[in-house]
């Protein structure tokens, strides 16, 4: 049996051979898993417990958002002596157990990632039968979903004093920087307006006064790519047209 010294004054990787001490409950998860939207990700989770060779019924659970109280996204149960954990819940059918709970591994695979999946996840194991015990990771693992920018809305709206304003909303991770370009806005590009604001993965930028007819283009860019969309203003028609 190999045990790691946990005296912080000593090298954590030093190992010594010992007779096997009683294990305590602990759960080990990485700080973060990063993956791109549309891809799959593995959320690793391993655990130790004090019940030697536990072979009774067990339940593996993953929840999102917060420990102990967040909504469950996955749950499976294994009968006494069984290595098969039968799935009882898999939110949208996108979650499946990759690890083997009988071998202290609760690792979860998440398919078809979306930006909305970017949150913290917490693994939990419950023993039933002869032993009633349970344990859940306290800090969880953060799933960091990255995505190239996508402009999800661009529009021209009436503003004060018969003027028009334009709004552009984009999503992405890292949150994209937005820039407007158009007639009389300078060299084909404009700095992100001061009214630009972010909410989660959404970023909105407003062009408060469209003073000239023509094409106004919103560009969203982050380290993974860029996206453009345009609106057209024709005030002499008494209306505005939009094209993306």
């Amino acid at each position: 049996f190999v045990r790691t010294k946990i005296d912080t004054t000593e090298n954590l990787l030093n190992t010594e051979v010992h007779s096997s001490p009683a294990q305590r409950w602990s759960m080990q998860v990485p700080a973060e898993v990063s993956a791109a939207a549309g891809d799959a990700a593995v959320l690793p989770c391993t655990f130790t417990h004090p019940h030697r060779h536990y072979d009774g019924p067990l339940t593996a659970i993953w929840r999102a958002g917060e420990p102990y109280a967040g909504p469950q996204v996955f749950r499976c149960a294994a009968a006494r002596g069984s290595e098969l954990c039968q799935t009882a819940l898999s939110l949208h059918g996108r979650f499946r157990l990759l690890g083997n709970p009988r071998r202290n591994d609760l690792s979860l695979r998440v398919e078809r990632l979306a930006l909305a999946d970017d949150r913290r996840y917490f693994c939990r194991v419950e023993f039933a039968g002869d032993v009633h015990d349970r344990y859940e990771s306290r800090h969880g693992v953060r799933l960091h979903v990255t995505a190239a920018p996508r402009i999800i809305n661009i529009s021209v709206l009436p503003g004060p004093a018969h003027a028009f304003r334009a709004l552009c909303t984009a999503e992405g991770e890292p949150p994209p920087a937005l820039a407007w370009s158009g007639p009389a806005l300078g060299n084909g590009s404009a700095a992100v307006p001061s009214s630009g604001q972010g909410h989660g993965h959404l970023v909105t930028a407003e062009l408060p006064a469209l003073n000239h007819d023509g094409r106004y283009t919103c560009t969203a860019a982050n380290s993974l790519g860029r996206s453009e969309a345009s609106v057209y203003l024709f005030r002499f028609h008494g209306a505005s047209g939009a094209s993306t």
């Epitope: 790691t4 602990s26 080990q28």
Partner: antibody
Framework: QVQLVQSGAEVKKPGASVKVSCKAS????????MHWVRQAPGQGLEWMGW????????NYAQRFQGRVTMTRDTSISTAYMELSRLRSDDTAVYYC?????????????????WGQGTSVTVSS | DIVMTQSPDSLAVSLGERATINCKSS????????????LAWYQQKPGQPPKLLIY???TRESGVPDRFSGSGSGTDFTLTISSLQAEDVAVYYC?????????FGQGTKLEIK
């Protein structure tokens, strides 16, 4: 002492597969993750993924998904990495490396022991 | 993925002098839950596999000479060799293990001037 001994050099044609072995000794094989890292000629280090020898759970870097398979045989304390549909840019030295102690509370997943490396050349 | 960028790409230092290698991560690798930096340093000599030198950004692996030290937090880290020895000629890599997939810096080649 901890030792990781890898299989010998391989020369493969594009489209073929290669399977590299890594025999561990000097520690309890199922207590630690086993990582695979590759290094193209004159280039840096690239993490490919890991296998948990205790549970057989794997985690692959996205760029190798669908092409890499990591397995283990606990009876002989050996980990394997198979890479399929080989391309010329897969030419590299492939290393196995011992990773985190499964029972340690913090996620200390550094690679504290390395195999000697297996040279894989992909050429038509 | 977290991008690790080392500087300089190569470095020539006289024997007995101090060598300093920098590593910058594109996002913080400091975990607020335990206040630890998930960063390691490796040394790779020609024709050999890498060797772990430092983890948690500043903890020396057993058997590593105390002339090697690591410092930094968040996104900026430094490996320092206080008095360069001939056997320290190698390529040095930083690696983050905060976020999966794990990533390495491109390496810094250290030579003797």
């Amino acid at each position: 002492q901890v030792q990781l001994v890898q299989s010998g050099a391989e020369v493969k044609k594009p489209g073929a597969s290669v399977k590299v072995s890594c025999k561990a000794s000097g520690y309890t094989f199922t207590d630690y993750y086993m990582h695979w890292v590759r290094q193209a000629p004159g280039q840096g280090l690239e993490w490919m993924g890991w296998i948990n020898p205790n549970s057989d759970g794997t985690n692959y870097a996205q760029r190798f998904q669908g092409r890499v398979t990591m397995t283990r045989d606990t009876s002989i304390s050996t980990a394997y990495m198979e890479l399929s549909r080989l391309r010329s840019d897969d030419t590299a030295v492939y290393y196995c490396a011992r990773g985190r102690l499964l029972r340690f509370f913090d996620w200390l997943d550094v690679m504290d022991a390395w195999g000697q490396g297996t040279s894989v050349t992909v050429s038509s | 993925d977290i991008v690790m960028t080392q500087s300089p790409d190569s470095l020539a230092v006289s024997l007995g002098e101090r060598a300093t290698i920098n590593c910058k991560s594109s996002r913080s690798v400091l975990y607020s839950s335990n206040n630890k930096n998930y960063l390691a340093w490796y040394q790779q000599k020609p024709g050999q596999p890498p060797k772990l030198l430092i983890y948690w950004a500043s903890t020396r692996e057993s058997g590593v000479p105390d002339r090697f030290s690591g410092s930094g937090s968040g996104t900026d880290f430094t490996l320092t060799i206080s008095s360069l020895q001939a056997e320290d000629v190698a390529v040095y890599y930083c690696q983050q293990y905060y976020s999966i997939p794990y990533t390495f810096g491109q390496g810094t080649k250290l030579e003797i001037k």
